[in-house]
């Protein structure tokens, strides 16, 4: 292992949201038998470029009159996709994004798919199932996640810079061992992503290797670098 080398310590991106091609797990809810039917709202982080499937409430087709998906995306008019069972008619209003579609024909499957998920798909999605006795709702606050690109380099004598570039939401950076760190800098991009930069200095020569740990909803990443022992020498590693 050469001096001043940058090593990927863990790229174990622990995807708790490993596959978004299945519907979100059902939440614990208790339905009562009144006409006021429960509305379930779920916050759901989804990784960009994956396939996401959003589900309606568990109402069988035989009990339905109309299935409606309402899609509210930032800065766009509300899009509505609906299917009326009696007439076998599908209708769309203000829906322009071709990546958001029914999984199948609505009479076969009422689920909605986003393929692939883009950063612009942040928003609120609601399935409304109309039955003869009232409506059932299931809503999703979809938060699109973007994995940041992590870089680590020694900028000058025993000072390291760790960057988590263009992540969504902002990543968190920590160091092992702790150094003398400048306040973390954040740069916001127009598309909703954030670059986080942390700069730290280690005065004592007893510290030879430092690790930058980046925590993010899409998974954690740690990089380490060997600090140059000789003052004045400047080298970066990839």
């Amino acid at each position: 292992q050469s001096n001043n080398s940058l090593m990927l310590q863990t790229s174990k991106e622990n995807h708790t949201l490993a596959s978004n091609s299945l519907c979100m797990d059902e939440k614990q809810i208790t339905q009562n038998h009144s006409k006021v039917l429960a509305e379930v709202n779920i916050s759901w982080p989804v990784q960009m470029a994956r396939n996401a499937v959003l589900c309606c409430p568990p109402i069988e087709f035989r009990n339905l009159i109309v299935i409606t998906w309402e899609i509210i995306l930032r800065g766009q008019p509300s899009c509505t996709k609906s299917y009326r069972k009696e007439t076998n008619e599908t209708k769309e209003t203000n829906c322009t994004d071709e990546r958001i579609t029914w999984v199948s024909t609505p009479d076969q499957n009422s689920d909605l798919q986003i393929h692939p998920v883009a950063i612009t798909h942040d928003g609120y999605y609601r399935c409304i199932m109309a039955t003869p006795d009232g409506n059932f709702h299931r809503g999703y606050h979809l938060q699109v996640l973007v994995t940041p690109e992590v870089t680590l380099f020694e900028s000058r004598n025993r000072t390291a810079v760790c960057k988590a570039v263009a992540g969504k939401p902002a990543a968190q950076i920590s160091w092992i061992p702790a150094g003398d760190c400048a306040p973390t800098e954040q740069e916001y991009w127009g598309n909703g992503t954030v670059t986080v930069k942390s700069t730290c200095h280690w005065e004592g020569h007893n510290v030879s290797t430092v690790t930058c740990h980046v925590s993010h909803l899409t998974g954690n990443k740690s990089l380490y670098i060997e600090l140059l022992p000789v003052p004045g020498a400047k080298k970066s590693a990839k």
Epitope: L22, P58, R62
Partner: antibody
């Protein structure tokens, strides 16, 4: 209050037919699917089929396709099941049960109709 | 058709203890993010009574000592603490597609 009232016990001869009823009250009859379930003495439950009174949509368990005929009468809020060509294997308690929208569960059941097939 | 296998066929549990009943499906009962697996209690001479729906949701009016868990193909009904009135036969049911099917039943006896 939702109630499903089933007709009384029947003693019938082999080869004959029997028609039992399930009268619904306490809700809009045509809004909910009604299912029928069989339970032989000391045994488990077996799904027979359903009828949707709204449009008379009917689905059967293949096993009961030629055995059970399901009908409904909107005017009296009643569903019926007729069993034909009876044998001792048809001796059982028959339940009607209303399907709830959410999860297709059976939250309301009739008290059951006992059918005894005997010579 | 999905086959539901319940175990044990019968069990005896002391008052106040935990009763655990298992239901295994021949294939996954999960459809569109939901497990269409319900639990019923039946006492002699009575119709079944719904306890748990969609694997883990307690039906209105059912005591909180009843709970359901599981996903995919393996499901469990737990009763804790068991009371005298819980002596009954318990059935799991699948309702995700036709035909609906029931497990063979588990008879619970209170010691």
């Amino acid at each position: 209050e939702v109630q499903l009232q089933q007709s009384g016990p029947e003693l019938v001869k082999p080869g004959a037919s029997v028609k039992m009823s399930c009268k619904a009250s306490g809700y809009t009859f045509t809004s909910y699917v009604m299912h029928w379930v069989k339970q032989k003495p000391g045994q488990g439950l077996e799904w027979i089929g359903y009828i949707h009174p709204y449009n008379d949509d009917i689905k059967h368990n293949e096993k009961f396709k030629d055995k059970a005929t399901l009908t409904s009468a909107k005017s009296s809020s009643t569903v019926y099941m007729e069993l034909s060509s009876l044998t001792s294997e048809d001796s059982a308690v028959y339940y009607c049960a209303r399907e709830e929208y959410y999860g297709s569960r059976f939250a309301y059941w009739g008290q059951g109709t006992l059918v005894t097939v005997s010579a | 058709d999905i086959v539901l296998t319940q175990s044990p066929a019968s069990l005896a549990v002391s008052l106040g203890q935990r009763a655990t009943i298992s239901c295994r499906a021949s294939k996954s009962v999960r459809t569109s993010g939901y497990s269409y697996l319900h639990w019923y209690q039946q006492k002699p001479g009575q119709p079944p009574k719904l306890l748990i729906y969609l694997a883990s949701n307690l039906e209105s009016g059912v005591p909180a000592r009843f709970s359901g868990s599981g996903s995919g193909t393996d499901f469990t009904l737990n009763i804790h603490p068991v009371e005298e009135e819980d002596a009954a036969t318990y059935y799991c049911q699948y309702s995700g597609e036709l035909p609906f099917t029931f497990g063979g039943g588990t008879k619970l006896e209170i010691k």
